[in-house]
Amino acid sequence: YDFTNCDFEKIKAAYLSTISKDLITYMSGTKSTEFNNTVSCSNRPHCLTEIQSLTFNPTAGCASLAKEMFAMKTKAALAIWCPGYSETQINATQAMKKRRKRKVTTNKCLEQVSQLQGLWRRFNRPLLKQQ
């Protein structure tokens, strides 16, 4: 999906109002310095591409994020404010459904959510130079 035509300001507002709080809840009890950010993004569409991938695609050691509260609200935001997004997800989701597991919070998942927090922060500051 090409995130170029999304309403970035509305997605940002939804992130600041509620998604960010759900990410913090997920990470509660974890030190903010515990994980190094290794995933980066260069502009808002790129950030959403990376956010979408880390949130919804199962990875080795962490297959459960798509069922978390922040993921549900992220999906809602992308579907509402990115034209055509929900239609493009139909085939992708069917392929992944069988691989999803529910609510197993591993250290790998915590690391992945820490990366997500970094991507969202970057999404919110699009004019900053890439480091």
Partner: antibody
Framework: QVQLVQSGAEVKKPGASVKVSCKAS????????MNWVRQAPGQGLEWMGQ????????NYNGKFKGRVTMTRDTSTSTVYMELSSLRSEDTAVYYC??????????????WGQGTTVTVSS | EIVMTQSPATLSVSPGERATLSCSVS???????LHWYQQKPGQSPRPWIY???TLASGIPARFSGSGSGTEFTLTISSLQSEDFAVYYC?????????FGGGTKVEIK
């Protein structure tokens, strides 16, 4: 304007199944999660689960796991909630409720009129 | 599962009086994830207050919401006849979504 219109009242025998529909209009159906909430007579509200019409993804309340199935038909903008192995305690009004961002806060912003399901032998 | 406990179960108030409804949450949640709904007999619930303190469209200013963490409050500064109803709090912080048992505001 957003409208959620539910199917009519049902009377079922214990052990049977019931399928309630909720037809949506006035918004982009595929882009909003739909929730199902029930209310037993004189009781409070109980969340049963939700479905994302765009791809059919579901999240169920563990209390109903195995008994509830939520589906959707995008061609008619309708979501369905089927509850099986009915017992008398399932007698309730069943509501569909859209999940949406209001002032960028996420909540159930529109509700159907409710469908009364009576389970009686 | 997050348990929502509302008190009192029934609140008897005279028109014009102040009403305070409480919602206690079993584990701390963000204020953005606490909502209130109003329900009248024979009707569907209606969104009333979003995110602890944001009034839904058309809700009069005599209603207000406050709180944080595990304790939240809905206040009606001067009760009008149309305010008599059941009010439910609800959390959207973790699955399963849960509601309080409701507070019925009735005429004294």
């Amino acid at each position: 304007q957003v409208q959620l219109v539910q199917s009519g009242a049902e009377v079922k025998k214990p052990g049977a199944s019931v399928k309630v529909s909720c037809k949506a209009s006035g918004y982009a159906f595929s882009s909003y999660w739909m929730n199902w909430v029930r209310q037993a007579p004189g009781q409070g509200l109980e969340w049963m689960g939700q479905i994302f019409p765009g791809d059919g993804e579901t999240n169920y309340n563990g209390k109903f796991k195995g008994r509830v199935t939520m589906t959707r038909d995008t061609s008619t903008s309708t979501v369905y909630m089927e509850l099986s192995s009915l017992r008398s305690e399932d007698t309730a009004v069943y509501y569909c409720a859209r999940g949406g961002y209001v002032n960028f806060l996420y909540a159930m912003d529109y509700w159907g009129q409710g469908t009364t399901v009576t389970v009686s032998s | 599962e997050i348990v929502m406990t509302q008190s009192p179960a029934t609140l008897s108030v005279s028109p014009g009086e102040r009403a305070t409804l409480s919602c206690s949450v079993s584990s701390s949640i963000s204020s953005s994830n606490l909502h209130w709904y109003q329900q009248k007999p024979g009707q569907s619930p209606r969104p009333w207050i979003y995110g602890t303190s944001t009034l839904a469209s058309g809700i009069p200013a005599r209603f207000s919401g406050s709180g944080s963490g595990t304790e939240f409050t809905l206040t009606i500064s001067s009760l009008q006849s149309e305010d008599f109803a059941v009010y439910y709090c609800q959390q959207w912080s973790s699955y399963p979504l849960t509601f309080g048992g409701g507070t019925k505001v009735e005429i004294k």
